[in-house]
Amino acid sequence: MAVTACQGLGFVVSLIGIAGIIAATCMDQWSTQDLYNNPVTAVFNYQGLWRSCVRESSGFTECRGYFTLLGLPAMLQAVRALMIVGIVLGAIGLLVSIFALKCIRIGSMEDSAKANMTLTSGIMFIVSGLCAIAGVSVFANMLVTNFWMSTANMYTGMGGMVQTVQTRYTFGAALFVGWVAGGLTLIGGVMMCIACRGLAPEETNYKAVSYHASGHSVAYKPGGFKASTGFGSNTKNKKIYDGGARTEDEVQSYPSKHDYV
């Protein structure tokens, strides 16, 4: 029950996170005009990954797209790439995790297969979240650098520029949405990985050792102490625990997920 809850919660948290990453990527307010020194301004500038906008005091808004790829800063391109990779990985992760959910039955899918898929989606969510956090952090770092550079320019009059028209940009709403969304996706991914451990078929810590006495086949099982005597080749050693019976062969044919973690 706890496993199902953990898996379900991980899925929902990741879903919210990926929706947030998509929203942040599409938002125009990645950087907003710093109004600290100029609180009363006729126009308010803000920029996104895809276009920049001007909102006039009356509310009229005009946005201009970044139609070119070549003229854009490499950092902006990198942020775009990170966010898109995050969205793609997250979307694939969501698709995989839907089929991995314990509450959804698809044919005769084994628990081990669901465990595999849960781990895969979990890892995808983790990478997706990291991509989003990295993308937003790179953009934030770029803003901080530019902010202090433009502040220095304002007070030193560097390069004979007209300082009165210098527009400084600060963190926009999209950055906070991106950070939170990335964090949620990351948490969702971790929860999926935790759920995967509970989904994996359980195994005893000891391998069964058979001691063959002359004439009779006797299997001594440490822990279970259920000896099975039999004549001929039709005899199979059974490992009995947790109310379920499986042959040793069957158990060994499905490696535990713990082997990979």
């Epitope: 920029q47 920049s52 001007v54 005009e62 201009r64 797209g65 139609f67 070119t68 003229g71 007209v162």
Partner: antibody, heavy 120, light 111 residues
Framework: QVQLVQSGAEVKKPGASVKVSCKAS????????MHWVRQAPGQGLEWMGI????????SYAQKFQGRVTMTRDTSTSTVYMELSSLRSEDTAVYYC?????????????WGQGTLVTVSS | DIVMTQSPLSLPVTPGEPASISCRSS???????????LDWYLQKPGQSPQLLIY???NRASGVPDRFSGSGSGTDFTLKISRVEAEDVGVYYC????????FGQGTKVEIK
């Protein structure tokens, strides 16, 4: 083809108001901004303001703030420009011009102009 | 507001000869998207203005290739490779950022 047809010439007294219309045809009305530009006799072009026909939001040049009102009627694809408290220096030809709301922002089509004469 | 300054204000030309008009802005018109938001318009006598050049250097549809625009940032130029009689009128540069402003205009007339 794209056409912007403006209303006829007007003669007004100082202090009165004038409302000039601009009927658009040949394109999707809500996909393009509409500007108003005026030209006093023997003078250059002067930008007055802009309206987004899609939502009706407007932006006016500082000089005309409080005196100009731009509206639109999507059912008839018509934009209106009303200028109040008319003065003799408002005597000019008033043009409407459309610009793309997405790409170039340049005014690619212009109306034929409406002459507004303010005289006592 | 951005101030647009055109020169010369009057340009007498000889048909077949080249002509050049300059336009300078008080602030850079180079947008963060890599485009220069400057347009050139021609207003022929008794007519409405017509778009010649947009985004600094792109010819509008139907505009003869003898017209070309160049420049970036704050300095722009409109060139007519071979002036024809029909090119007479007043040429205006206009910046497409907020709020829009026009240059004073350059009157081109035949000598």
């Amino acid at each position: 083809q794209v056409q912007l047809v403006q209303s006829g010439a007007e003669v007004k007294k100082p202090g009165a108001s004038v409302k000039v219309s601009c009927k658009a045809s040949g394109y999707t009305f809500t996909s393009y901004y509409m500007h108003w530009v005026r030209q006093a006799p023997g003078q250059g072009l002067e930008w007055m303001g802009i309206i987004n026909p899609s939502g009706g939001s407007t932006s006016y040049a500082q000089k005309f703030q409080g005196r100009v009102t731009m509206t639109r009627d999507t059912s008839t694809s018509t934009v209106y420009m009303e200028l109040s408290s008319l003065r003799s220096e408002d005597t000019a030809v008033y043009y409407c011009a459309r610009s793309s709301a997405y790409g170039t922002y340049s005014m690619d089509y212009w109306g034929q102009g409406t002459l507004v004469t303010v005289s006592s | 507001d951005i101030v647009m300054t055109q020169s010369p204000l009057s340009l007498p030309v000889t048909p077949g000869e080249p002509a050049s008009i300059s336009c300078r802005s008080s602030q850079s018109l180079l947008h963060s998207n890599g485009y220069n938001y400057l347009d050139w318009y021609l207003q022929k006598p008794g007519q409405s203005p017509q778009l010649l050049i947009y985004l600094g250097s792109n010819r509008a549809s139907g505009v003869p290739d003898r017209f070309s625009g160049s420049g970036s940032g704050t300095d722009f130029t409109l060139k007519i490779s071979r002036v024809e009689a029909e090119d007479v009128g007043v040429y205006y540069c206009m910046q497409d950022l907020w709020p829009r402003t026009f240059g004073q205009g350059t009157k081109v007339e035949i000598k």
